[in-house]
């Protein structure tokens, strides 16, 4: 049995550079007890986007829209998309822990920048 | 329907132990967080343990870590609460409580009473 | 721990009147926008039954009499108009972060 999944909807999403790009992100439980964070790219050299409880992302905002029972919203807007920002983003749920652990992430959605 | 239903409460020695079982109907209970509240006329409604649908991971508060162990069978829909070195403060009504989100509580049942007294 | 104080501690209100009771957290329950504050009715001799989930969210069967707002620290559940059957303690809880914590739960009376 699933303890928990964590659903990205969207594989892709299209923006237009100066826009505003929201990336979904639908968790279906609590448990495992940890954070959520988002990541550009995987593997160890991955970019960390959003961290609910640490650091400084002033291009970030949280956007929950579901009012479900069945699942929490951790879902994000990324203002003023530039080309470089282009790339895979994954939505990752961790364990917590000393230190937390990855426990599961999302199937990532691919973010495409379009010319103004 | 739904129905969560208690059992194995009663009255025990300090010191002593309880098992108390929760028996699940009316719902997918392999999908469902599981918890136990307690509820005291002095301290009200107080978290008492978590376990994950899957049953690998439990959460208990510090007030009764160490002595209490949840456990569950989802091929039996049944939750189980092992209760050892009972103490008077561990005097309550327990509930049973399911989760679908490891969130709110979404239903209770009965309660079934432990008196921890010498 | 995250504490949560609810106000007042009993309330008497005229049938068909408002009812609000508030329920203040220690720290933010909010997490990416979703308040992990949860409302629960309790009757006599009753297991507590759930109301509103994540501050503002009507529970499946439950009279729209009811509703919940807030966020971060600050939450509000009001009953309008109230009615006799809605004679009994109400109490929030946080699931933002462990242990999970409780009010101290508000009784509500007809005047």
């Known amino acids: 049995e699933e303890e928990l999944q964590v659903i990205q909807p969207d594989k892709s999403v299209s923006v237009a550079a100066g826009e505003s790009a929201i990336l979904h992100c639908t968790v279906t439980s609590l448990i495992p007890v940890g954070p959520i964070q988002w990541f550009r790219g995987a593997g160890p050299a991955r970019e960390l986007i959003y961290n609910q409880k640490e650091g400084h992302f002033p291009r970030v905002t949280t956007v929950s829209e579901s009012t479900k029972r069945e699942n929490m919203d951790f879902s994000i807007s990324i203002s003023n998309i530039t080309p470089a920002d282009a790339g895979t983003y994954y939505c990752v749920k961790f364990r917590k822990g000393s230190p937390d652990t990855e426990f599961k992430s999302g199937a990532g959605t691919e973010l495409s920048v379009r010319a103004k | 329907e739904v129905q969560l239903v208690e059992s194995g409460g009663g009255l025990v020695k300090p010191g002593g132990s309880l098992r108390l079982s929760c028996a699940a109907s009316g719902f997918t209970f392999s999908s469902y967080v599981m918890s136990w509240v307690r509820q005291t006329p002095g301290k009200g409604l107080e978290w008492v343990a978590t376990?994950?649908?899957?049953?690998?991971?439990?959460y208990y508060p510090d007030s009764v870590k160490g002595r209490f162990t949840l456990s569950r069978d989802n091929a039996k829909n049944s939750l189980y609460l092992q209760m050892n070195s009972l103490r008077a403060e561990d005097t309550a009504v327990y509930y049973c409580?399911?989760?679908?989100?490891?969130?709110?509580?979404?239903?209770w049942g009965q309660g079934t009473t432990v008196t921890v007294s010498s | 721990d995250i504490v949560l104080t609810q106000s007042p501690a009993s309330l008497a209100v005229s049938l068909g009147e408002r009812a609000t009771i508030s329920c203040r957290a220690s720290?933010?329950?909010?997490?990416?926008?979703?308040?992990?504050m949860h409302w629960y009715q309790q009757k006599p001799g009753q297991p507590p039954k759930l109301l509103i989930y994540r501050a503002s969210n009507l529970e499946s069967g439950v009279p729209d009499r009811f509703s919940g707002s807030g966020s971060r620290t600050d939450f509000t559940l009001t009953i309008n108009p109230l009615q006799a059957e809605d004679v009994a303690t109400y109490y929030c809880?946080?699931?933002?972060?462990?242990?999970?914590?409780f009010g101290g739960g508000t009784k509500v009376e007809i005047k």
């Open positions: 376990i994950s649908s899957g049953g690998t991971y439990t």
């Open positions: 409580a399911s989760q679908l989100t490891g969130s709110e509580f979404d239903y």
């Open positions: 720290e933010s329950v909010d997490s990416y926008g979703n308040s992990f």
């Open positions: 809880h946080q699931s933002a972060d462990l242990p999970w914590t």
